[in-house]
């Protein structure tokens, strides 16, 4: 009997408001045994996969997606999904990334505190569950 997969969560480090040219890392979390984490942008047409999974806790795994130099075009909605054989999970909630021009003032913080989106009751499309990840994956430029 197939297990019910918990919805992933998504967060951003150092936060969700990022100065132009700074870096941001999206962190996706799911259960132990995840083979592939996918970070989706706005819709499923733009995404990035990783199989570089590590432990977040005894009961959770995580993957990180780093954008080295944030551009205005990186602003938008992001969410996570994962593949734990033999099926895909539901999507996480969306997390919105905002890109601001650096003010450079000594008193203005560069980012807002880290923000995350975990499971909620929002309905979610399960059609991913039929498909395994593409065997060749995707290059980073598909998303970044």
């Amino acid at each position: 009997q197939e297990e019910d997969l918990p919805r992933p969560s998504i967060s951003a480090e150092p936060g969700t408001v990022i100065p132009l040219g700074s870096h941001v890392t999206f962190v996706c979390r799911g259960p132990v045994g995840v083979q592939t984490f996918r970070l989706e942008r706005d819709s499923r047409s733009t995404y990035n996969d990783t199989e570089d999974v590590s432990q977040a806790s005894p009961s959770e795994s995580e993957a990180r997606f780093r954008i080295d130099s944030v551009r205005e075009g990186n602003a938008g909605l992001y969410r996570c999904i994962y593949y734990k054989p033999p099926k895909w999970s539901e999507q996480s909630d969306y997390l919105e990334l905002l890109v601001k021009e650096s003010s450079g003032g000594p008193d203005s913080p560069d980012t807002e505190p880290g923000s995350s989106a975990g499971p909620t009751q929002r309905p979610s499309d399960n059609s991913h569950n039929e498909h395994a990840p593409a065997s060749q994956g995707l290059k980073a430029e598909h998303l970044y």
């Epitope: 045994g33 199989e51 570089d52 432990q55 005894p58």
Partner: antibody
Amino acid sequence: EVQLVETGGGLVQPKGSLKLSCATSGFTFNINAMNWVRQAPGKGLEWVARIRTKNNNFATYYADSVKDRFTISRDDSQSMLYLQMNNLKTEDTAMYYCVRGPYFDYWGQGTTLTVSS
Amino acid sequence: DIQMTQSPASQSASLGESVTITCLASQTIGTWLAWYQQKPGKSPQLLIYAATSLADGVPSRFSGSGSGTKFSFKISNLQAEDFVTYYCQQLYSTPYTFGGGTKLEIK
């Protein structure tokens, strides 16, 4: 078909150096962490080193027994994994395996290192 | 470092029987545990990951259980090709330590 092929093993004198290579194919190398594991003759398995992906700043980790002597590296453009081994000791004599992470699901056939005078 | 204590070091059994191998972690690792099979002169092969998940292509007579610090690995209906060596490994934190191995011998 996933393939990992290690090369570069051989006979080296103590305090010598050697570089092992692992050519990979059949999977997306640049999104996978990679490991080296070794097995001394007639002994059990010992994890040696791990390297993560660009998303994780190519972070590296080592067993205490090889720290400061071995260096793991990767070339994503060529789907290659390497292990530079310096100041070799007789106890480094082993079969060295290249292994895909994080679940160690694919292993190469291994390459043999013998450290002896 | 997390120590993995695997037992027994060797075990004799007959064809068709079941055997169970145990692995104890020196601290909690959740379900970050894998089991491998190694045939003489061959590379290890992943059988079980995440303590209970069967790797691709592995027969269902292999199974894993446990979480936290105590883990078990069971082979049901032993076949001739199963009489080889098995290892556990924790994947919770580096160094990713292995158990000492269990050699299955035919009775």
